[in-house]
């Protein structure tokens, strides 16, 4: 039968080295065997490149395309092929569809004055446009009480958050995770970082009385 696209490709760029496109076919498809996504920068002399998609689900395909360090003017022509059949054609401007890289190395350290210091790494090198543009969201949740969670917006430059131990339940196990976004690029949120877990051993003041 004929091959059809149910949901056309949706693409995001990490604005440093990779753009990822995802789309859904109208029936289960072996993406890597049946489909190819060609991409070409709209720039004089540029070559046509081919991405071999992989299956994310039975009918969902995803393609990761290596790109050069992106700049605002970059526009790519995308063509989705099933053999000689052109299924979809469109354009993609990475700077208009940014999904930041995931923050890394989230750690929790005890700090002075009964505070926890949460630290993570900015996923971009200092020379990249996004390095100084990221703001973060930190989610802290009680592992044993789904109702006990807090969300912190970190809008200052440093990838750190100081957390008063007294704001958390004593003796409880907590997990934290962090994600990033770039306001000036009107980006989507990054994926969440892996969680890090710690025991909040702060002793409330009343117990000293």
């Amino acid at each position: 039968g004929s091959v059809k696209v149910l949901h056309e490709p949706s693409c995001f760029s990490d604005y440093i080295s990779t753009s990822v496109c995802q789309w859904k076919m109208d029936h289960p498809t072996n993406c890597s065997a049946e489909l190819r996504l060609s991409y070409q920068l709209d720039f004089m002399g540029s070559e046509n490149h081919t991405c071999v998609p992989e299956n994310r689900e039975d009918s969902v395909c995803v393609c990761s395309m290596p790109i050069d360090d992106a700049v605002e003017a970059d526009v790519y022509q995308l063509d989705l092929w099933a053999g000689q059949q052109l299924l979809w054609s469109g354009s993609f401007q990475p700077s208009k569809h940014v999904k930041p890289r995931t923050p890394g190395n989230l750690t929790v350290h005890p700090n002075i004055s009964h505070t926890w210091l949460l630290m993570w790494t900015n996923p971009y090198p200092t020379e990249n446009h996004l390095h100084s543009e990221l703001t973060y969201m930190v989610n802290v949740s009680n592992d044993n009480d789904p109702e006990d969670f807090k969300v912190y917006n970190v809008t200052y430059m440093g990838p750190t958050l100081r957390l008063a131990a007294s704001t958390l339940k004593s003796g409880a196990s907590y997990s934290a995770r962090v994600r990033a976004w770039a306001q000036t690029y009107n980006s989507t949120w990054s994926d969440w970082s892996p969680s890090t877990t710690w025991l909040n051993y702060y002793e409330p003041w009343e117990q000293h009385l």
Epitope: F43, M44, G45, E47, D68
Partner: antibody, heavy 125, light 112 residues
Framework: EVQLVESGGDLVKPGGSLRLSCVAS????????MTWVRQAPGKGLQWVSL????????YYADAVKGRFTISRDNAKNTLYLQMNSLRAEDTAVYYC??????????????????WGQGTLVTVSS | DIVMTQTPLSLSVSPGETASISCRSS???????????LDWYLQKPGQSPQGLIY???KRASGVPDRFSGSGSGTDFTLRISRVEANDTGVYYC?????????FGQGTKLEIK
């Protein structure tokens, strides 16, 4: 050492055809776009055409579009310019030049960083 | 099409002096910050052209630092300091951003 050697220039009548060749050596030919530039006697430089490294994309000046065809044989390290329906105003020295590196996603630009010695095309009855 | 305009069309300079040539484009040649697709070429009498400057300000291999390029957007300048007799020839600017590529009319530099 990078070398570009053009050949094929000749005296030809208006309406006639000619094929210029440019043999390259000293660099990885298939990785670079190549360009033809011409210079009419006593005049300035005029860009003619460009072809990317794979040969998959070509560009032309309006003055030659539909009459000239740029091509390349990467196995032979050779660039070509097929010129048809020649006119008196096509009389010029034709230079081939190495252009941008196109094997990267965004071509890396170094200008026209090496030129051949040129070949003279004369169109006259 | 992008039109390239050079001034002056001819220039006479004494050895040791500085020569300046201006090039203006009808559209911006800036693709992104630091990437101005404007080149300068020199054609000495009886020779093929040779590259001097690319991307507005980067010197081609083997070009002495007496040659410098500056500018962005639509306005660019080539400066030749401590001019020598060997610098005589015609200087061309060229835009390499989009098809059709285009050269300026050329500036003839004469050494007094």
């Amino acid at each position: 050492e990078v070398q570009l050697v053009e050949s094929g220039g000749d005296l030809v009548k208006p309406g006639g055809s000619l094929r210029l060749s440019c043999v390259a050596s000293g660099f990885t030919f298939r990785d670079y776009a190549m360009t033809w530039v011409r210079q009419a006697p006593g005049k300035g430089l005029q860009w003619v055409s460009l072809i990317n490294g794979s040969g998959g994309k070509t560009y032309y000046a309006d003055a030659v579009k539909g009459r000239f065809t740029i091509s390349r044989d990467n196995a032979k390290n050779t660039l070509y310019l097929q010129m048809n329906s020649l006119r008196a105003e096509d009389t010029a020295v034709y230079y081939c030049a190495v252009d941008r590196l196109t094997k990267t996603i965004r071509p890396q630009y170094y200008g026209l960083w090496h030129w051949g010695q040129g070949t003279l095309v004369t169109v006259s009855s | 099409d992008i039109v390239m305009t050079q001034t002056p069309l001819s220039l006479s300079v004494s050895p040791g002096e500085t020569a300046s040539i201006s090039c203006r484009s009808s559209q911006s040649l800036t693709y992104s910050i630091g990437y101005n697709y404007l080149d300068w070429y020199l054609q000495k009498p009886g020779q093929s052209p040779q590259g001097l400057i690319y991307l507005g300000s980067k010197r081609a291999s083997g070009v002495p630092d007496r040659f410098s390029g500056s500018g962005s957007g639509t306005d660019f300048t080539l400066r030749i300091s401590r001019v020598e007799a060997n610098d005589t020839g015609v200087y061309y600017c060229m835009q390499g951003l989009q098809s059709p590529l285009g050269f300026g009319q050329g500036t003839k530099l004469e050494i007094k």
